[in-house]
Each structure stands twice: as structure tokens, then as C-alpha cells.
């Protein structure tokens, strides 16, 4: 399965929308900075077969979609940008699901993948814990928005490496 060019464009559009969603200066939130322990190792891509890599990406986008679909998120971000962002993520999820269906026939997904998906879930669990701890303050959401932008940028490099492998 070739990850379509539209998926790459979708990723770029999602990043642009995330950037546009910023409402307050990140400099005013420096005291709220937090290391969420992004599982970089899961996106190194060396130990991965294609179906594994795609399912880890899918998990990350799914978790991002869930995070920005909450009531607290709706109360924080500008509605039209949030809707566009959700639509973009939904399209990416559909692309990746179509790819996984094709790839699973080609190769068995090893159990190793279970670890990677759980690592991504824990990462988002830490983000949710942080937001709860900070009572979903504007600065906490700003820190999370910046973190998701960073993780999307890193996963974008991962996707490009995947495409080159093809």
C-alpha cells in the first residue's frame, strides 16, 4: 500500500491548523512547560514492518482526535478551526485504515506492535493527566497544542521515511 500523497498533504494541513489554533503567546506559559515523554523510539522506524508502522501512526492520530473531541477542547479552541482539524484527522484515519487492511494480508502484525501502541496510549494518558492537574487552563491547553504539533512534526518525518522505503 502506498500512503497517498493526500495523506502527506493532510498531515501538513493538520499542522497548519494546529498552528492557527494558538490563541495565547507560548512565552506567557513557560512556567507550565512539561515533558510528556513522547515515545520517540516508537517512531524511529528501524524495527518496523509497514503494517506495524501504519498502526502506530493510526493510534497516534486516533488519540489526537479523541483529545480534541472533548467538551473541554470545544470550550477552548475556535470552533471552525477545531472542526477543520477534526475533519483532517478523520481523513488521515481513513487513509491509514485502508492501508492497514491491504498490508495485513501481506504480513502478519507481530506482537511487538502491542508494545508500541500501548506506549502511544500512555503518552496521551500523560497529556490527559496533565490537563486534569492543571484544570484545563488556557496555558495547559497551549502547552498541549505545542506538544501535539511537535509530535506531529516527528511523525511526519517518520511517514516520509516510510514513503521512501516504498
Amino acid at each position: 500500500c502506498d500512503l497517498p500523497q493526500t495523506h502527506s498533504l493532510g498531515n501538513r494541513r493538520a499542522l497548519i491548523l494546529l498552528a492557527q489554533m494558538g490563541r495565547i503567546s507560548p512565552f506567557s506559559c513557560l512556567k507550565d512547560r512539561h515533558d510528556f515523554g513522547f515515545p520517540q523510539e516508537e517512531f524511529d522506524g528501524n524495527q518496523f514492518q509497514k503494517a506495524q508502522a501504519i498502526s502506530v501512526l493510526h493510534e497516534m492520530i486516533q488519540q489526537t482526535f479523541n483529545l480534541f473531541s472533548t467538551k473541554d477542547s470545544s470550550a477552548t479552541w475556535e470552533q471552525s478551526l477545531l472542526e477543520k482539524f477534526s475533519t483532517e484527522l478523520n481523513q488521515q484515519l481513513n487513509d491509514l485504515e485502508a492501508c492497514v487492511i491491504q498490508e495485513v494480508g501481506v504480513e502478519e502484525t507481530p506482537l511487538m506492535n502491542v508494545d508500541s501502541i500501548l506506549a502511544v496510549k500512555k503518552y496521551f494518558q500523560r497529556i490527559t493527566l496533565y490537563l486534569t492537574e492543571k484544570k484545563y487552563s488556557p496555558c495547559a491547553w497551549e502547552v498541549v497544542r505545542a506538544e501535539i504539533m511537535r509530535s506531529f512534526s516527528l511523525s511526519k518525518i517518520f511517514q516520509e521515511r516510510l514513503r521512501r522505503k516504498e
Partner: antibody, heavy 122, light 107 residues
Amino acid sequence: EMQLMESGGGLVQPGGSLRLSCVASGFTFKSFAMSWVRQAPGKGLEWVASVGSQGGSKYYAPSVKGRFSISRDNSNNTLYVQMNSLGVEDTAFYYCVKETDAVATMDALDMWGQGTLVIVST
Amino acid sequence: DIRVTQSPSSLSASVGDRVSISCQTSQSVNIYLNWYQQRPGKGPQLLISAASTLQSGVPSRFSGSGSGTDFILTIISLQPEDSASYYCQQGYITPYTFGQGTKVEIK
């Protein structure tokens, strides 16, 4: 009875390599992440590396990244660490440790072996 | 990396005394702070996980409290067998980091 038994320690020259093994018994090895933690004689504890329950999700301390490699064989209930380019600062007791969850982070180190001593010296 | 600062580095107390060891982290680790005991010549043993959860088989005189960045291990009534080194560790993210340790001696 739950047990972790390390082996493979010994004297090695700077720049040399060593492979440590740890055999687990008394619990479902394939369900838990495993770590290596070291302790230089008379010093504190330093986490070295962790591997997820299925052999994925490998994490390393900055001090060993690129030199050490953690792996596991669930069919033989065995954890390994391959240590290359060893330096005198790697001299320590190496403990094999069971984690409380399937992958590292947001958990604890709930069972420790007796440790194996690695001495890096000329 | 998350820095973990433990104090004091050593203490001497009498049997029956109440003893407290403090642990601070450089950023919030929520409740993911663990405490270990290491007796001389032995491997460490988990006493308390997730800030306050006592492990099975650990005497009830040990207790843990705190969340975020500030944590405390308390031994309510010190016993001779409690002579050991105690370490706190953040299990929130990797690299896992430990406090420098506190050596507890019996007077």
C-alpha cells in the same frame, strides 16, 4: 516463588563487550516490561534500559544509548543486555528488574534480582 | 530528564522514632513516584508505588504521601531491621531517575 537470576558479569577491558543474561521464573514473563538497573559500588541506583513485554518499546539511558542493546526471549523467559564499548564508568552491579506494566513509564520496578558485578578495568 | 532530589542524605534515629524522607521532582510526575529499600549487600526492594500504595508484605509502619512534585516517605515507628538505604524514583517517563538515596542508621 518469583525469581530473577542474572549471569554473565565479570572483568572486561575498556573498549570490550559483555552480554548479561537474566532468567525469570515464578511469574508470566511475557506479560511485563523488564529493565536493567545498575549501581556502582557504594553509589546510588541508575536505570539503564527497558524493553516492552513483547520485545518492542526499547528505551535507554542517555549514558548507554548507542552502546547497549536490550532484548528478551519470551519462549525462554530470558532478558539480555549486550554491552559494547565499555568504559570504567560502566563498572557496577547490574540488576535485572521486573516492571509492573507491559511497557515502560507510569509504573514501578517491583522485583529485583541479586545483581551481577561488571568490572571494566585494565 | 526529570531531576529527582532526595533529602536528607543520611539520618540517625532511635528505635520507635518517627522518620520522614523527602523527595522532590523537577516537574510534576503526577502520582508516579516509587520508594525502594536496600539493605546492605542486597538488591533493592519496592516498598511503595504510585506515591502511596504499600506493597504486599511491607509493614504498615511505612507510608507514602504526596503528588505532583513533592513526596514523603514516613516510617511511623523505626525498627532495627529498617536500617538501610532508601531511594525514591520517578516512574512517570523514561529515562527513569532516582534520588541520591538516604542512609538510615539506628542510634
